[in-house]
């Protein structure tokens, strides 16, 4: 029998400075593109090598982005969320939710689409 998988959820404010090639990450999610069941939130799906986010080091694949420059990302269409990031300016403040897996017992399998990464 597999051990129970629990999650530790933490929030963090991450301030990024837009680099020459931008912020350096990809997102999934939105009201028209639910990546996680029953959750239309915006999640980080890729951190680009040597991009601003990667060099900062705090944003991780699987993180949920709650707000950009204080603007809530709830109930946004996917492309509207993309556009919000693209128009966010040079200094970008992200409120993010990290969901860390805490393993109790045997190691389980974390599948694609699981927001923990």
């Amino acid at each position: 029998m597999n051990g129970r998988v629990d999650y530790l959820v933490t929030e963090e404010e991450i301030n990024l400075t837009r680099g020459p090639s931008g912020l350096g990450f990809n997102i999934v999610g939105g009201t028209d593109q639910q990546y996680v069941s029953n959750d239309s939130g915006i999640y980080v799906s890729r951190i680009k090598e040597n991009g601003a986010a990667a060099l900062d080091g705090r944003l991780q694949e699987g993180d949920k982005i709650l707000s950009v420059n204080g603007q809530d990302l709830k109930n946004l269409l996917h492309q509207d969320a993309v556009d919000l990031f693209r128009n966010a300016g040079y200094a970008v403040s992200l409120r993010v939710q990290h969901r860390l897996q805490v393993q109790n017992g045997p190691i389980g399998h974390r599948g694609e689409g699981d927001p923990s990464g």
């Epitope: 090639s21 931008g22 912020l23 350096g24 990450f25 999934v28 593109q33």
Partner: nanobody
Amino acid sequence: QVQLVESGGGSVQAGGSLRLSCTASGRTFSTYTMAWFRQAPGKEREFVAAISWSGAYYADSVTGRFTISRDNAKNTVYLQMNSLKPEDTAVYYCAAVIGSTVDSYWPGDPLEYDYWGQGTQVTVS
């Protein structure tokens, strides 16, 4: 890890048509940005077409002749190639990345994509 498998390549005479398919693993295919690139012998890999959540993109050399589309229920992206020319002869590669970049999207940049297929040969005589 995403696996990509291309099919549909072959030999055709100039003016003919082919439809390439690329099937991807993974249950969140609808979130993938997908692209086709090609590489002719002795030449660099060249962007052909891409399809993201926001729409389709094409290289100038194929605009009006090639059409990229996707069927999310089948985890498959297609490249319909019409009015083929000898210069379209190449190995055609499917590429994918999960999600949409929050930066300016340059579909022709191979670094935008994390996953690549093995390629399928297209020969136009």
